[in-house]
């Protein structure tokens, strides 16, 4: 992008974005997904329940891949259960985008592939 | 054109060090993810680390966590893995892969660099 | 970590045959899951990539489906310099395991 073509904060890929409720079987991995462009390059954090979603804020803390604008959550327990928000910004603008996340407790004996969508 | 180059390959004893550099050209270093794939001798392929492009996420195979450790030098267009408390079940072929942006897929890779592990 | 399972674990074709190979996650993974095709000696080279996209410079004969837990790799119609180990790859989770391979070989 052009260094003098200043832009706000966008979304570059809402197809990944769709999906906004995510049923997780407990102990499976989540990713939530915010891919953005902007002119300077945005930044990104997250926020769960309206708050700074902190690493202390969950056991084994979270991973987030800032050059694939994703946060991920391992090992998914009861707890992470909430609203997960990413904030996107730069100095021309903010954009933001919650998912909802529930984990599901997944009898044992059920089915080996437990199925839920993305 | 895009090339990636490992070397410091070899032969060394159990519990020992080595440390394996991927040097890159024909893109902006910077700009990508690298990660580090083995595969053992007659095996499949093994992922074991990836560090993003400035260096600020890193991220580890089980099987190799708290032994081995991805780190690179942008100035230098060069891709490490630092090798300690080496196992024979450390031995492979390592290569060096660059992630396609907003991707982890792999689109270009090194040759290999063959690690020993043996007394 | 998330488990890769191919199937088969090898197969035998002729060339000018469909074939298909298939892999399953142990958990949803969405889209997040690319093929390599790898010859003897060689490095791996990316097929598809995100369950579906055509690797720039791959033949259009190859093609990828799927998402969730279950993944298609489709060869339309097999060429001689298609026999190789075919290997599916998350990368959902931080840790981006490899299937086990597929290996197709002459009939």
């Known amino acids: 992008m052009n260094s003098n073509n200043k832009r706000a904060p966008y979304w570059t890929n809402t197809e990944k974005m769709e999906k906004r409720l995510h049923a997780v079987p407990a102990a499976n991995t989540v990713k939530f997904r915010c891919p953005a462009g902007g002119n300077p390059m945005p930044t990104m954090r997250w926020l769960k329940n309206g708050k700074e979603f902190k690493q202390e804020h969950r056991i084994g803390g979270y991973k987030v891949r800032n050059q694939h604008w994703s946060l991920i959550m391992e090992s998914v327990v009861p707890s992470d259960k909430g609203n997960y928000t990413c904030v996107v910004e730069n100095e021309y603008g903010s954009i933001n985008h919650t998912y909802h996340l529930d984990v599901v407790l997944v009898p044992r004996g059920s089915l080996e592939h437990h199925h839920h969508h993305h | 054109q895009v090339q990636l180059l490992e070397s410091g390959g070899g032969l060394v004893q159990p519990g020992g060090s080595l440390r394996l550099s991927c040097a890159a050209s024909?893109?902006?270093?910077?700009?990508?993810?690298m990660s580090w794939v083995r595969q053992a001798p007659g095996k499949g392929l093994e992922w074991v680390s990836v560090?993003?492009?400035?260096?600020?996420?890193?991220h580890y195979a089980d099987s190799v966590k708290g032994r081995f450790t991805i780190s690179r030098d942008n100035s230098k267009n060069t891709l490490y893995l630092q090798m300690n408390s080496l196992r024979a079940e450390d031995t492979a072929v390592y290569y060096c892969?660059?992630?396609?942006?907003?991707?982890?897929?792999?689109?270009?890779w090194g040759q290999g660099t063959l690690v020993t592990v043996s007394s | 970590d998330i488990q890769m399972t191919q199937s088969p674990s090898s197969l035998s074709a002729s060339v000018g045959d469909r074939v298909t190979i298939t892999c399953r996650a142990s958990?949803?993974?969405?889209?997040?899951l690319n093929w390599y095709q790898q010859k003897p000696g060689k490095a791996p080279k990316l097929l598809i990539y995100?369950?579906?996209n055509l690797q720039s410079g791959v033949p259009s004969r190859f093609s990828g489906s799927g998402s969730g837990t279950d993944f298609t790799l489709t060869i339309s119609s097999l060429q001689p310099e298609d026999f190789a180990v075919y290997y599916c790859?998350?990368?959902?989770?931080?840790?981006?395991?490899f299937g086990q391979g597929t290996k197709v070989e002459i009939k």
């Open positions: 995100d369950a579906s």
């Open positions: 958990q949803d993974i969405s889209s997040d």
């Open positions: 560090i993003e492009g400035d260096g600020s996420y890193t």
């Open positions: 024909g893109f902006t270093f910077s700009d990508y993810a």
């Open positions: 892969a660059r992630e396609k942006t907003y991707s982890s897929a792999f689109d270009y």
């Open positions: 790859q998350q990368h959902y989770s931080p840790s981006h395991t």
